[in-house]
């Protein structure tokens, strides 16, 4: 026997979308009498957000569908429905089961820089030097393509001196020097970095930009003939 069922549905789907089916068996006769005819109903929903009627169940098939708009994984990632199955077509004995509805993630949240402004100091001539770690927040499912950040230097790196990679665990952007900086040539660089996700956005979202002011520190260099 099974008293817990599991299903899933994408966040933001339209009412009428089918989620899953639950089934209860009854050995009694269902042809000549109603003794074995099972009727399904939803007894309760937890949590009751955004309200307590997000799902409906087909009385005779046990198919659970979305009845209301507003499924938002970032607010409620899982719903727990208590399902009642009653024989005699709803007038007889009742048994209960649990249906867990997992709300699947869509990339409906953009990563946002926090903070958006950074200042860093780098000794001149240093190659592969970690300049700054940039931090983003993203409300989508952790460690998924909708959460993982992709960083791009949009401006301020005319000499192609910098590179930025994504830390696989923290999701931070790690800004490093690709080649040595020359204090005597330019003692300050202002970089503009944009962040997006590995996965495309499912709707038009504003992209976040960070500004990094990099101060180049003078290193005493030997005289050259």
């Amino acid at each position: 026997t099974q008293d817990t069922f599991r299903g899933s549905v994408l966040e933001g789907v339209l009412p009428g979308t089918s989620v899953m089916q639950v089934t209860a068996t009854d050995e009694d006769d269902a042809i000549y009498t109603y003794n074995g005819v099972v009727a399904y109903s939803i007894h309760s929903q937890e949590p009751k957000d955004p309200h307590d009627l997000m799902f409906t169940i087909h009385r005779s098939t046990g198919t659970i569908s979305v009845i209301s708009s507003g499924l938002d994984r970032e607010k409620v990632p899982e719903y727990t429905l208590t399902i009642q199955a009653t024989d005699m077509d709803g007038d007889g004995s009742t048994t209960t089961a649990v249906a867990v509805v997992e709300i699947l993630d869509a990339n409906d949240n953009a990563p946002m820089f926090d903070p958006q402004k950074y200042e860093a100091h780098v000794p001149e001539n240093a190659v592969g030097h970690e300049v700054q770690r940039l931090t983003v927040t993203d409300l989508d499912a952790p460690n998924s393509p909708a959460w993982r950040a992709t960083y791009l230097i949009m401006g301020g790196d005319d000499g192609d001196h910098f590179t930025i990679t994504t830390h696989p665990e923290s999701n931070q952007g790690i800004l490093t020097t690709r080649k040595g900086l020359d204090f005597e040539a330019k003692n300050q660089h202002t970089l503009y970095v944009e962040v997006t996700n590995e996965a495309p956005f499912v709707l038009k979202l504003p992209t976040s930009t960070a500004t990094i002011v990099v101060h180049v520190e003078d290193v005493n260099e030997a005289p050259v003939f």
Partner: antibody, heavy 120, light 113 residues
Framework: QVQLQESGPGLVKPSETLSLTCTVS????????WTWIRQPAGKGLEWIGR???????NYTPSLKSRVTMSVDTSKNQFSLKLSSVTAADTAVYFC??????????????WGQGTLVTVSS | DIVMTQSPDSLAVSLGERATINCKSS????????????LAWYQQKPGQPPKLLIY???TRESGVPDRFSGSGSGTDFTLTISSLQAEDVAVYYC?????????FGQGTKVEIK
């Protein structure tokens, strides 16, 4: 590295309310379910309930009438309140994070646990 | 609730030998749409919180030695320690997360023979 730390009174009188707070450091409270689990001395683990960073909650049916959980994302904290306690609620209380890898449910980070004794 | 039953309650194994712990769920914890078993294994040493070893029945948590492995599907699962070390003495728990209401097995105590 994410770390969790429970805090609250170690002694609660019968019929009163047990209150515990878990402080999360080294990571954000956002995007995850945060859980309370208890363990009576020499016994197994009992799941009490969980709260999502948005405030959405689930409680174990046997304790549902007595449990309230809350979250404060600005402080990176979440809390447990268990009302009308009896000696049977004496246990080590753990806070934990539900990890995520294509689904929630397993506990990948735990607090050290705090012993709560119910006694007059 | 889904009831998790572990066997044996305790076992004594010689150093370097294989230790096998079984876990049975009262209903299947396999979600066929994802082809994943919603089952985890933990290790708990005295005075410490449990430590995650395995999730999705067979995925080893980062940093866990490869002598620990998980297997099984549906209702029957196994945690295997291929070559028992002194530091593996602990109580081991299985846990299902197929249901919202998470439940643990009663625990299996592993000692050195």
């Amino acid at each position: 590295q994410v770390q969790l730390q429970e805090s609250g009174p170690g002694l609660v009188k019968p019929s009163e309310t047990l209150s515990l707070t878990c402080t999360v450091s080294g990571g954000s409270i956002n995007n995850y379910y945060w859980t309370w689990i208890r363990q009576p001395a020499g016994k197994g683990l009992e799941w009490i309930g969980r709260i999502y960073s948005s405030g959405s909650t689930n409680y174990t049916p046997s304790l549902k009438s007595r449990v309230t959980m809350s979250v404060d994302t600005s402080k990176n904290q979440f809390s447990l309140k268990l009302s009308s306690v009896t000696a049977a609620d004496t246990a080590v209380y753990f806070c934990a994070r539900e990890g995520y890898n294509d689904g929630y449910g397993y506990f990948d980070h735990w607090g050290q646990g705090t012993l709560v004794t119910v006694s007059s | 609730d889904i009831v998790m039953t572990q066997s044996p309650d305790s076992l004594a194994v010689s150093l370097g030998e294989r230790a096998t712990i079984n876990c049975k769920s009262s209903q299947s914890v396999l979600y066929s749409s994802k082809n994943k078993n919603y089952l985890a294994w933990y290790q708990q040493k005295p005075g410490q919180p449990p430590k995650l070893l395995i999730y999705w029945a067979s995925t080893r948590e980062s940093g866990v030695p490869d002598r620990f492995s998980g297997s099984g599907s549906g209702t029957d699962f196994t945690l295997t320690i291929s070559s028992l070390q002194a530091e593996d003495v602990a109580v081991y728990y299985c846990q299902q997360y197929y249901s919202t209401f998470r439940t643990f097995g009663q625990g299996t105590k592993v000692e050195i023979k």
